[in-house]
Interface confidence: low
């Protein structure tokens, strides 16, 4: 799903307050709800009728450093006989997510949000068939 | 996929630099790659064999303010005849994502990352059959 553009007002103080320095704000360390965890069914990437593989990208100046991308294994879907059925299509499910980028010049360290497109998994769909006029 | 705990070193300056004030860092405004967009197949939530609905939560002190959650419509999957097949299961695909939380007390505004579990869509899987010994 799409993340809208960040509104100008989001980083501003209330109108009655003195203005903040342009361009940077205070980021508290630590993560709210850091301990909550995904609880998905086991091995859904191999049990799905639209199975997928994962690849991992790693960047030490990003939080999270590890970002996992899914790739659909097939163009079609796997039927009850375990064979690929190309009358159906495996399609990726994408999500826009935020990561935190660490930037440093000498001893000056700052952070900035970065938007990343993540393919989370795949689903099996009926194809859109274009009828030739 | 899981986001690991943020390492203590992530928010620190290089060792040779003077220590930073405990608890907060500089957050640059603006979003890197803000304009990149999801380009998923059209209407996959209704064309999927494991279809889903979306609900939207809204919070003006969060970026993004709008977080969209998917809910699988069925326990089973939709077969070629458009009927639910309960020999297969529709299961949610979850993703841990980060949002930015705005906190203000009077004229003091700060920000903190928050982890949110998002259900992005659903996929159709073969059920795990538990054999009774």
């Amino acid at each position: 799903r799409k993340i809208p553009k960040v509104g100008h007002t989001f980083f501003q103080k209330p109108e009655s307050c003195p203005p903040v320095p342009e361009g940077s704000m205070k980021l508290d360390t630590g993560i709210i709800n850091e301990n909550q965890r995904v609880s998905m069914s086991r091995n859904i990437e191999s049990r799905s009728t639209s199975p997928w593989n994962y690849t991992v990208t790693w960047d030490p100046n990003r939080y999270p450093s590890e970002v996992v991308q899914a790739q659909c294994k097939h163009l079609g879907c796997i039927n009850a006989q375990g064979k690929e059925d190309i009358s159906m299509n495996s399609v990726p499910i994408q999500q826009e997510t935020l990561v935190l980028r660490r930037k440093h010049q000498g001893c000056s360290v700052s952070f900035q949000l970065e938007k990343v497109l993540v393919t989370v998994g795949c689903t099996c769909v009926t194809p859109v068939v274009h009828h030739v006029q | 996929r899981k986001i690991p705990k943020v390492g203590h070193t992530f928010f620190q300056k290089p060792e040779s630099c003077p220590p930073v004030p405990e608890g907060s860092m500089k957050l640059d405004t603006g979003i890197i790659n803000e304009n990149q967009r999801v380009s998923m197949s059209r209407n996959i939530e209704s064309r999927s064999t494991s279809p889903w609905n979306y609900t939207v939560t809204w919070d003006p002190n969060r970026y993004p303010s709008e977080v969209v959650q998917a809910q699988c419509k069925h326990l089973g999957c939709i077969n070629a005849q458009g009927k639910e097949d309960i020999s297969m299961n529709s299961v949610p695909i979850q993703q841990e994502t980060l949002v930015l939380r705005r906190k203000h007390q009077g004229c003091s505004v700060s920000f903190q990352l928050e982890k949110v579990l998002v259900t992005v869509g659903c996929t159709c899987v073969t059920p795990v059959v538990h054999h009774v010994q």
Partner: nanobody, 122 residues
Framework: DVQLVESGGGLVQPGGSLRLSCAAS??????MGWLRQAPGKEREFVAA????????YYADSVKGRFTISRDNSKNTLYLQMNSLRPEDTAVYYC?????????????????WGQGTLVTVSS
């Protein structure tokens, strides 16, 4: 968005071989395909490969002669064309689709390269 640049086209005699390459910048986990357009004809599907590279499809007219492959570490798609025939003469395009709706339909590919001309003639 994905940018695609094809190379490797040229003039070849019937029965000869060519290897087309397509360098992709941007996302590389899309399914990708090769399509072609002969003079005065519509674009037609040639071959497709899944994002992981596990899965390939071919038009009947090229099956057994052409091989599609990809190297995700190099962000490159390939088409090895053997036993070329005069009717293979066309501009060859590499294209990508975020989850192919329908592999055979040229209308369902969204990002296209500029094309590379393959001429098979004696």
């Amino acid at each position: 968005d994905v940018q695609l640049v094809e190379s490797g086209g040229g003039l070849v005699q019937p029965g000869g071989s060519l290897r087309l390459s397509c360098a992709a910048s941007g996302r590389t986990y899309d399914a990708m395909g090769w399509l072609r357009q002969a003079p005065g004809k519509e674009r037609e599907f040639v071959a497709a490969i899944s994002g992981s590279g596990d899965d390939t499809y071919y038009a009947d007219s090229v099956k057994g002669r052409f091989t599609i492959s990809r190297d995700n570490s190099k962000n490159t798609l390939y088409l090895q064309m053997n036993s070329l025939r005069p009717e293979d003469t066309a501009v060859y395009y590499c294209a990508t689709r975020r989850g192919l709706y329908y592999v055979w339909d040229a209308n369902d590919y969204e990002n296209w390269g500029q094309g590379t001309l393959v001429t098979v003639s004696s």
